[in-house]
């Protein structure tokens, strides 16, 4: 059987053979991959990139959250959606997950001007069916998925909006475990609305196998701030393996070449 995909840190600290990022299959060796370094001064302003409209993001829910062996994932089950933001159609929220390290300088997947952040949060959405503008696009959409990417840095205050998620981590240390979070809304996890006006946009891929090149990326300029202990909880409470020998951290795909693509900004 073919080895399962993994991150470099798992291969270094585990006896199980697995495929590290440079050996990922599927579409992962193509040329329109994510994440990338965003050179902020090279990104051209596009007036079409307006504000986002969030539907259902403010509704308090008891979300299911799981350790999937690669990250921690909240199941959003179409209970929220987004539109605007220069997107071609409304998109339904499917899941939310994060990437992190155990040090402040290398936990994000995307980087801004070469700088990585402590964490990165991805809210993954799928385009509502029947909204593609032409047949070609419907068959081979490069924007079937819209990911909102939020960089995370340390601040001096506890971010109360993240506490339901952080507190749930203790219940899902091992892969395939799931739990129900205390009631919260997606809006609780986001920066204030005025901080969502500035973002970068490019076309890329999923950052995990099979790395499908069908993602319209939105990387927000303003980071979310979490307290030091909230950030550390992810690498302290979660494990890649059922034996709880390999702490879940450095679940970060290396940067990919921008190539012929362009990055635009709001």
């Amino acid at each position: 059987a073919e080895s399962h995909w993994c991150y470099e840190v798992q291969a270094e600290s585990s006896n199980y053979p697995c495929l590290v990022p440079v050996k990922w299959g599927g579409n992962c060796q193509k040329d329109r991959q994510s994440p990338i370094n965003i050179v902020t001064t090279k990104a051209k302003v596009d007036k079409k990139l307006g504000r986002f409209f969030f539907s259902g993001y403010d509704k308090k829910q008891t979300w299911t959250v799981q350790n999937n062996g690669h990250s921690v994932m909240m199941l959003l089950e179409n209970k929220a959606s987004i539109s605007g933001g220069g997107l071609p159609a409304p998109y339904q929220a499917k899941q939310l997950h994060l990437h992190w390290s155990d040090l402040p300088y290398k936990g994000s997947e995307h980087s801004l001007d070469g700088e990585h952040f402590a964490m990165e949060m991805h809210i993954v959405h799928e385009k509502e069916k029947g909204t593609s503008r032409n047949v070609k696009e419907a068959q081979d959409p490069e924007d079937e998925i819209a990911v909102l990417a939020f960089l995370v840095e340390a601040g001096t205050q506890v971010n109360e909006g993240f506490q339901p998620l952080v507190e749930a981590l203790s219940n899902i240390p091992k892969p395939e475990m799931s739990t129900t979070m205390a009631e919260s809304s997606l809006l609780d996890l986001l920066p204030k609305e005025e901080k969502l006006r500035h973002y970068f946009r490019y076309l890329g891929s999923l950052t995990t196998p099979t790395c499908d090149e069908k993602v319209v990326w939105t990387v927000f300029r303003e980071p979310i701030q979490l307290h030091r202990e909230q950030i550390l909880a992810f690498s302290q409470k979660l494990y890649y393996d059922k034996e709880q020998t390999v702490s879940m951290k450095d679940n970060v795909r290396p940067l990919q070449q921008l190539g012929q693509r362009t990055v635009i900004k709001s």
């Epitope: 390290s101 155990d102 001096t156 690498s235 951290k249």
Partner: antibody, heavy 119, light 107 residues
Framework: DVQLVESGAELVRPGTSMKMSCKAS????????IEWIKQRPGQGLEWIGV????????HYNEKFKDKATLTADKSSSTAYMQLSSLTSDDSAVYFC????????????WGQGTTLTVSS | QIQITQSPAILSVSPGERVSFSCRAS??????IHWYQQRTNGSPRLLIK???ESISGIPSRFSGSGSGTDFTLSINSVESEDIAVYYC?????????FGAGTKLELK
């Protein structure tokens, strides 16, 4: 009270290695990063690297990545820095410090370990 | 990496005078600057965090201001125990960097 106590002054020969320690007390050792800083006589402060004592994860200033190795022992709440292939340029005071916010300021410092490299 | 320039290198003051130290970053760093005092043969001591936020246990005569690229540490009435070297540190970008320091001495 938070305290960081560093090991005593060392006089060592060029080409050798040495390991200094930084014992922490008064707080949860695994919940804060430990940073190491170099200060040459009469000079400013230069950041060497950082360790997460909880995980053992390290990150180095490019300039020191072949010079310094950072480790930590959770059971004794002690961080260590080993310096290798010592030359007179390594003669300095070395400080450990606790990092307050996860990538920001250093709120508590050790008293410093003076290293003299001389034949 | 971000360069930090402190000026002047030496400041001479009389007790009771107000004194200001300058720190300039090579690019905008918001308010991510922290100030330290280092007395002769001592360890650095944190005085001000995030450009202007006070630190518990530090005398109120120490204050900080600025954002972007230009920052100031002020002592509103210098005392003899303030004789030391003062450093600023940026934590906006990795690797963190320090200024070369300003030495405060008595006239």
């Amino acid at each position: 009270d938070v305290q960081l106590v560093e090991s005593g002054a060392e006089l060592v020969r060029p080409g050798t290695s040495m390991k200094m320690s930084c014992k922490a007390s008064g707080y949860a050792f695994t919940n804060y990063l430990i940073e190491w800083i170099k200060q040459r006589p009469g000079q400013g402060l230069e950041w060497i690297g950082v360790i997460n004592p909880g995980s053992g994860g390290t990150h180095y200033n490019e300039k020191f990545k072949d010079k310094a190795t950072l480790t930590a022992d959770k059971s004794s709440s002690t961080a260590y820095m080993q310096l290798s292939s010592l030359t007179s340029d390594d003669s300095a005071v070395y400080f450990c410090a606790r990092e307050a916010d996860y990538g920001s300021r250093f709120d508590y410092w050790g008293q410093g370990t003076t290293l003299t490299v001389s034949s | 990496q971000i360069q930090i320039t402190q000026s002047p290198a030496i400041l001479s003051v009389s007790p009771g005078e107000r004194v200001s130290f300058s720190c300039r970053a090579s690019q905008s760093i918001g308010t991510r600057i922290h100030w330290y005092q280092q007395r002769t043969n001592g360890s650095p001591r944190l005085l001000i965090k995030y450009a202007s936020e006070s630190i518990s246990g530090i005398p109120s005569r120490f204050s900080g201001s600025g954002s972007g690229t230009d920052f100031t540490l002020s002592i509103n009435s210098v005392e003899s125990e303030d004789i030391a070297v003062y450093y600023c540190q940026q934590s906006n970008s990795w690797p963190t960097t320090f200024g070369a320091g300003t030495k405060l001495e008595l006239k």
